[in-house]
Amino acid sequence: FERTRSLQDPCSNCPAGTFCDNNRNQICSPCPPNSFSSAGGQRTCDICRQCKGVFRTRKECSSTSNAECDCTPGFHCLGAGCSMCEQDCKQGQELTKKGCKDCCFGTFNDQKRGICRPWTNCSLDGKSVLVNGTKERDVVCGPSPADLSPGASSVTPPAPAREPGHSPQ
């Protein structure tokens, strides 16, 4: 079948990195500068992606593969193949149409990307707040208020170390 196809379509013999040049009796011509073909039998070469502005070149274009971009410091990739770059913010902020804005009271963001999320509501799990939340950090939930009654320890002590053959005192 491949032989038949080759006889019918001379372009199928053109390897990656070339194109089937109709202007030259369907000779396989190398892709021109700044273009590539990643598969054989192509009638045109594709224009190489240019990594401009916020985009940095991660991998140069070759005759057989497109360039790959990533984002300059202060930005991160979004989308397939880093099709977009999105601005980083500081921890305790989120990106909006108006740029980076501080998280509202009661919310936090511990990353340079993403949105501010509400602090954990410790009481939903019957626990109390051990460490208050900030713009950058979630609250830390501790034992339930009932566990904090007089005489009760707020932190469970570690089990004493046991040596073989000895009972704990």
């Epitope: 979004l78 989308g79 099709s83 990106l95 149409k97």
Partner: nanobody
Framework: EVQLVESGGGLVQPGGSLRLSCGAS????????MFWFRQAPGKELEWVAN????????YYVDSVEGRFTISRDDAKNSLYLQMNSLRAEDTAIYYC????????????????WGQGTTVTVSS
């Protein structure tokens, strides 16, 4: 081919004005949020201003608020940045960029950038 080309940069004295232009081609300009970013020597790229599709929403970084004005002319497929009361710290390469498809609904990313135009503020 989708393309953005900036122009209008140059050398200007402190307190002076410049108007940057960005010509768009290869896409329906009126469908996209548009941006200006800048990169000062030795510093990270920073967002300067952005404008929504119909020009009704405009936002600026604090350091240029009241001095710079972003505008667009969809009939001319052009974005502008009017820069007044220029300061030495405004010296940078200024880039025009396009908001990616779905900008502000699902992300705040940009996908097409120009090559940049250089603004130097010096006496």
């Amino acid at each position: 081919e989708v393309q953005l080309v900036e122009s209008g940069g140059g050398l200007v004295q402190p307190g002076g004005s410049l108007r940057l232009s960005c010509g768009a081609s290869g896409f329906t300009f009126s469908n996209y949020w548009m941006f200006w970013f800048r990169q000062a020597p030795g510093k990270e790229l920073e967002w300067v201003a952005n404008v929504n599709q119909d020009g009704s929403e405009k936002y600026y970084v604090d350091s240029v608020e009241g001095r710079f004005t972003i505008s667009r002319d969809d009939a001319k497929n052009s974005l502008y940045l009017q820069m007044n009361s220029l300061r030495a710290e405004d010296t940078a390469i200024y880039y025009c960029a396009r908001g990616g498809e779905g900008y502000s609904d699902s992300h705040y990313g940009t996908d097409v950038w120009g090559q940049g135009t250089t603004v130097t503020v010096s006496s």
